[in-house]
Interface confidence: medium
């Protein structure tokens, strides 16, 4: 067990042009508070996933009103840290977000109205005991300075906070095969309490006899790295060829601890340990009121007049959660038609139309003629939310712009010539065919195919294409 | 212009059931929360609840759960109020009341004109 | 619930003078507070929030202060069209309007 302490140094403009507008005002005062969320490991999660280390919110800030005419300086912060309290051992890798949150007060608002100034994210190692580790993070304008370190709760010591001192018996040295508690100078490891051959590195215990695994560890005496990429089944016994060992359902599976609350296996059942705020056997409860500010991202808080009425948010459009702490992905409603792409840009859904269509949601199918003009004498052919064009002969392209080469595209069969001509191409057909395109075999006996040809035409003799 | 246009009068039997409505304009509708306010006897004025237009959540006055039922409409930005089971007690006047100037302000700022309700048989 | 006692229920003053009404909460509502006048016919009009800001548009004859659990909201130098009732709401934790105060001008 221990706790994780933050604490903010400052919070103001980032050095470079654009400077944020203070925001707060002669006739908007308002003040500050900050919300820190902890997860374990380093992965790559939401913003809205659970904050499963705990979460915390600090005090409000001192009332802050902009100077006219100053830049925005670095804002008054609360005092004191914010310290997030974990149970079971600090998983050494974490993933934390920082949320920088403005109080208005005043004139604009008739009780305080909060929003999001800035949010910070990073992931980082840190062992229990050390020192403080220094930060600076920035969020488009603003820069958050801070400071952050782990310590061990007495009885536990170690980076993990799974090693117990306790106090030493004899003045002068600790007792046989113990050592002393580094950098506890006055107190000696605790004797060995946990489950004989339980991993000092992977496995902690907070009974006698017990031997639970840190986040990625497991079997009996956390020795068996867990791995997913070999596991075949979900769930099973322990695979002698793969050395994988994957956990058979246990009371905490799936987290039944509600809002960010922990979850840790009793003999029995379960325990969750629950952030601030919340509390009931799954951290279903919440002890916060309306006063605390839970309503994330302007919703409105609505709670009842006694601490064990619930409050509400009614989130705004966007948003939802029971804190609206998530933003809605209202794109995977697919609501632009016809191929649009969406943009949500948090205040509003964007849909960028394909050519051919517009509206909101691109709804509109546009006459792909309307102001189209199909060059030469071609003709304007509407399909598929695109226009095009309908050459007249001897021209092609988008917009029959360009002239064509009319024997490109060989028209004459049966190995007869083509010859390009003004108005079109025309066909020099080799002995034995005739036709515009030399598509008709001349009979053996003179006669053809055909009626006869036109005046002045002898079948051999170029046909000309009109 | 922020506007809240409200149904006419009614008169209704004991027993009965009845929606009235308030249609919203000059604003995103399913940015504000819209609340229910009830005057009875030409004075009192009672919160019954408010539903939020973007999801249909609703909070109701613990005295109106059962006798309020709150929808909207979201394609007319229309709030409704369903008043169930009318008694002589709930003939009043019936405004809807917007906290909009500001961020998501909890006080009601934009009434509309009112909806006599009359009970008797 | 949170329930706000406003008093006098009706009052009755010259037109030039000055008359205030006072609303009680039965706890601390922590300056959450606004201040409406009402006409026949009319939707409530805001008047005044968060204890005393006065909304724009509003002349500064009105005025409000308190804190805690004890407010007041004051009218000076009355003119004809002051006459309407008047409501304080509390808005700390849902909402309850006061019992209404009638001013008539003698």
């Known amino acids: 067990a221990g706790v994780f302490e933050l604490q903010i140094h400052s919070f103001g403009p980032g050095p470079g042009p654009g400077a944020p507008r203070s925001p707060c005002s002669a006739r908007l005062p308002c003040r500050l508070f900050f919300r820190v969320c902890l997860k374990p490991g380093l992965s790559e999660e939401a913003a809205e996933s659970p904050c499963a280390l705990g979460a915390a919110l600090s005090a409000r800030g001192p009332v802050y009103t902009e100077q006219p005419g100053a830049p925005a300086p670095d804002l008054p912060l609360p005092d004191g840290l914010l310290q997030v309290p974990f149970r079971d051992a600090w998983p050494g890798t974490f993933s934390f977000i920082i949320e920088t949150w403005r109080e208005e007060l005043g004139d604009q608002i008739g009780g305080p109205a909060w929003s999001l100034l800035a949010r910070v994210a990073g992931r980082r190692r840190l062992a229990a005991g050390g020192p403080w580790a220094r930060d600076i993070q920035r969020a488009g304008a603003w820069e958050l300075r801070f400071s952050y370190r782990a310590r061990c709760e007495p009885p536990a010591v170690g980076t993990a906070c799974t090693r117990l001192c306790r106090p030493r018996s004899a003045p002068s040295r600790c007792g046989p095969g113990l050592r002393p508690c580094a950098p506890l100078e006055d107190e000696c490891e605790a004797p060995l309490v946990c489950r004989a051959g339980c991993s000092p590195e992977h496995g902690f215990c907070e009974q006698p006899g017990e031997c639970r695994c840190l986040e990625g560890w497991t079997g009996p005496l956390c020795t068996v790295p867990v791995s997913t990429s070999s596991c075949l089944s979900p769930r099973g016994p322990s695979s002698a060829t793969t050395g994988c060992l994957v956990p058979g359902p246990g009371p905490c599976d799936g987290n039944p601890c509600a809002n960010g609350g922990s979850c840790s296996e009793t003999p029995r059942s379960f325990e969750c340990t629950c952030p601030r705020g919340f509390y009931g056997l799954r951290c279903e409860v919440s002890g916060v009121t309306c006063a605390d500010g839970p309503c994330f991202n302007g919703g409105l808080c609505v709670g009842g007049a006694d601490p064990d009425s619930a409050y509400i948010c009614h989130c705004p459009p966007g948003f939802q959660g029971s804190n609206c702490e998530k933003r809605v992905d209202r794109c995977s409603l697919q609501p632009c038609r016809n191929g649009g792409l969406c943009l949500d840009l948090g205040h509003a859904l964007r849909c960028r139309c394909r050519a051919g269509f517009a509206g909101p949601r691109c709804e509109h199918d546009l006459d792909d003629c309307a102001g189209r003009a199909c060059a030469n004498g071609g003709t304007c052919v509407e399909g598929g939310g695109a226009h095009r064009c309908s050459c007249a002969l001897g021209f092609g392209g988008r917009d029959c712009r360009e002239r064509a080469d009319p024997c490109a595209a060989r028209p004459c069969a049966h190995g007869g010539r083509c010859y390009a001509h003004f108005s079109g191409l025309v066909c020099a057909c080799a002995p034995g065919y005739m036709g515009a395109r030399c598509e008709f075999p001349v009979h053996p006996d003179g006669a053809s195919a055909l009626p006869a040809a036109p005046p002045g035409l002898r079948p051999g003799d170029p046909q000309r294409y009109l | 212009e922020v506007q809240l246009q409200q149904s006419g009068p009614e008169l209704v039997k004991p027993g009965a059931s009845m929606k009235i409505s308030c249609k919203a304009s000059?604003?995103?509708?399913?940015?504000?929360?819209m609340n229910w306010v009830k005057q009875s006897h030409g004075k009192n004025l009672e919160w019954i609840g408010l539903?939020?237009?973007?999801?249909?959540?609703?909070t109701y006055n613990q005295k109106f759960k059962g006798k309020a039922t709150l929808t909207v409409d979201k394609s007319s930005s229309t709030a409704y109020m369903e008043l169930l089971s009318l008694t002589s007690e709930d003939s009043a006047v019936y405004y809807c009341?917007?906290?909009?100037?500001?961020?998501?302000?909890?006080?009601?700022?934009?009434w509309g004109a009112g909806t006599t309700v009359t009970v008797s048989s | 619930d949170i329930q706000m006692t406003q008093s006098p229920s009706s009052l009755s003053a010259s037109l030039g003078g000055k008359v205030t009404i006072t609303c009680k909460a039965s706890?601390?509502?922590?300056?959450?507070i606004a201040w409406y006048q009402h006409k026949p016919g009319k939707g409530p009009r805001l008047l005044i929030h968060?204890?005393?800001t006065l909304e724009p548009g509003i002349p500064s004859r009105f005025s409000g202060s308190g804190s805690g659990r004890d407010y007041s909201f004051s009218i000076s130098n009355l003119e004809p069209e002051d006459i309407a009732t008047y409501y304080c709401l509390q808005y700390d934790i849902l909402w309850t309007f006061g019992g209404g105060t009638k001013l008539e001008i003698k």
């Open positions: 539903i939020n237009p973007y999801n249909g959540g609703t």
């Open positions: 009341a917007l906290g909009y100037y500001g961020n998501y302000r909890r006080y009601f700022d934009v």
């Open positions: 706890q601390d509502i922590k300056k959450y």
């Open positions: 000059g604003y995103s509708f399913t940015g504000y929360t």
């Open positions: 968060y204890t005393s």
